[in-house]
């Protein structure tokens, strides 16, 4: 029997200081470019080596960015989201959602010959 894949979803506030080439990550998504089916949210597609996000270490590729400096990223066109990041200032606060994949073992009862814990 196959294991079930579950996801552990957590949220985190990440504060980054803009570097010479921005905050150090790329984004995809938006109402006009859905990255995840039926979800127009903004996602991190790449963390740039030695950029602000990589040096901080908390933001991960695949994270969903919920807000920038308190401004919600729901229902934004892709370019509007890009513009928010471009104009966010020197010190930037991101609310992000991490989605960690958790692989559970096969579901079923223990066999008679199995060791009992």
């Amino acid at each position: 029997m196959n294991g079930r894949v579950d996801y552990l979803v957590t949220e985190e506030e990440i504060n980054l200081t803009r570097g010479p080439s921005g905050l150090g990550f790329n984004i995809v998504g938006g109402t006009d470019q859905q990255y995840v089916s039926n979800d127009s949210g903004i996602y991190v597609s790449r963390i740039k080596e030695n950029g602000a996000a990589a040096l901080d270490g908390r933001l991960q590729e695949g994270d969903k960015i919920l807000s920038v400096n308190g401004q919600d990223l729901k229902n934004l066109l892709h370019q509007d989201a890009v513009d928010l990041f471009r104009n966010a200032g020197y010190a930037v606060s991101l609310r992000v959602q991490h989605r960690l994949q958790v692989q559970n073992g096969p579901i079923g009862h223990r066999g008679e010959g199995d060791p009992s814990g």
């Epitope: 790329n26 995809v28 790449r46």
Partner: nanobody
Framework: DVQLVESGGGLVQPGGSLRLSCAAS????????IGWFRQAPGKEREGVSC???????YYADSVKGRFTISRDNVKNTLYLQMNSLKPEDTALYYC????????????????????WGQGTQVTVSS
């Protein structure tokens, strides 16, 4: 300091070919969505071809089948191979990168890019 420097432009006859180069310094090219843009005298700037950090490509309808974008990550250089050139391809060609967008179509259609080169002139004339 982030810098993009284009080269490879010139005068070519209709039907001819050119290969433009865009050398990047101060950042790693394959971390960015980046593309080629052109502006002819009296016309608006046009996104010609763009490539995402993951290698997805976009081409304007006017150049599909004739132009090819590519990237050499070792040389940290972006290329545009231009074949079957037409007089209407005459323009100043720039490369430009987005610090945030990783969507090649959006980058090519954007007026809000973060790093620009100075451009290289391409003239197609007999």
């Amino acid at each position: 300091d982030v810098q993009l420097v284009e080269s490879g432009g010139g005068l070519v006859q209709p039907g001819g070919s050119l290969r433009l180069s865009c050398a990047a310094s101060g950042f790693t090219l394959d971390d960015y969505a980046i593309g080629w843009f052109r502006q002819a005298p009296g016309k608006e700037r046009e996104g010609v071809s763009c490539i995402s950090s993951h290698g997805s490509t976009y081409y304007a309808d006017s150049v599909k089948g004739r132009f090819t974008i590519s990237r050499d990550n070792v040389k940290n250089t972006l290329y545009l191979q231009m074949n079957s050139l037409k007089p209407e391809d005459t323009a100043l060609y720039y490369c430009a990168a987005s610090y945030y967008s990783d969507y090649e179509v959006a980058v090519c259609r954007s007026d809000a890019l973060d790093a620009w080169g100075q451009g290289t002139q391409v003239t197609v004339s007999s």
